[in-house]
Amino acid sequence: LTCLGGFASPGPVPPSTALRELIEELVNITQNQKAPLCNGSMVWSINLTAGMYCAALESLINVSGCSAIEKTQRMLSGFCPHKVSAGQFSSLHVRDTKIEVAQFVKDLLLHLKKLFREGQFN
């Protein structure tokens, strides 16, 4: 994973394939973005602490007709143990700020990188 070389997991056990694929997909989205992602659609900003996978899915699932993030939406469902439907919001949502999908993806990616640096992956 050359694009992840700067923040490899410090522990001896590598992160799961699923997580590696999610990060790769987020990297691909940010790198391959030419036109405004999802036509500049806005989504709720989320609390990037506990429950971020479910919260991220809840936020992104409200974006429809955007093929660029469909794979991300499918991947996130594998990280959230709950059933998530459009229009649903958990108590962990900030829900006072909307940001563009492109910024949302960048924020999520940066947070996952931070967690890697802190060694929070088994």
Epitope: A50, P81, F121
Partner: antibody, heavy 117, light 104 residues
Framework: QVQLVQSGGGVVQPGRSLRLSCAAS????????MHWVRQAPGKGLEWVAI????????YYADSVKGRFTISRDNSKNTLYLQMNSLRAEDTAVYYC?????????????WGQGTMVT | EIVLTQSPATLSLSPGERATLSCRAS??????LAWYQQKPGQAPRLLIY???NRATGIPARFSGSGSGTDFTLTISSLEPEDFAVYYC???????????FGPGT
Amino acid sequence: QVQLVQSGGGVVQPGRSLRLSCAASGFTFSSYGMHWVRQAPGKGLEWVAIIWYDGSNKYYADSVKGRFTISRDNSKNTLYLQMNSLRAEDTAVYYCARLWFGDLDAFDIWGQGTMVT
Amino acid sequence: EIVLTQSPATLSLSPGERATLSCRASQSVSSYLAWYQQKPGQAPRLLIYDASNRATGIPARFSGSGSGTDFTLTISSLEPEDFAVYYCHQRSSWPPIFTFGPGT
């Protein structure tokens, strides 16, 4: 009333099997991730397993991996724990617990517990 | 694997006093931390999630704080029903592996 009612505990010989059940009511069971947690006599809490709302993903503690299987039947609002190749160190009170909605790190509803000896 | 250490193991206090319970993680768990109360013969009860948020129905005398590796549960003024075992609890970011502290 939101509750989890457990059954299936008992005394079993080492090497044998046992299945625990956890019947949910008062909430939409099929929308929630669920757990099993255990507590050996006089000891602390030990997480055992988690299952996704639709059964698509399951994760286990190393101590039970390959021996225990978590499953669910959403049509019956019931969570199960199939325990095979039981050992003396599996003796504990077993709790089923609901995962806090939208979160991975908190269990907000617990069953009453069932003893496995 | 992240290990949680709770201190003190036993805290001897009287009703009306302030209780301060500590939970330390062997490595950063950000704010992925919860606190539970357990009384003899009963199932645990969720008190605090995400390090500092009180669960539904939990009295205001219970508060949680901390992030990274050091966390604290404070009971501002002990009521008779607060005498119990308290566990801290965390999960790894991925895969979801859960760990409890030994209890106070």
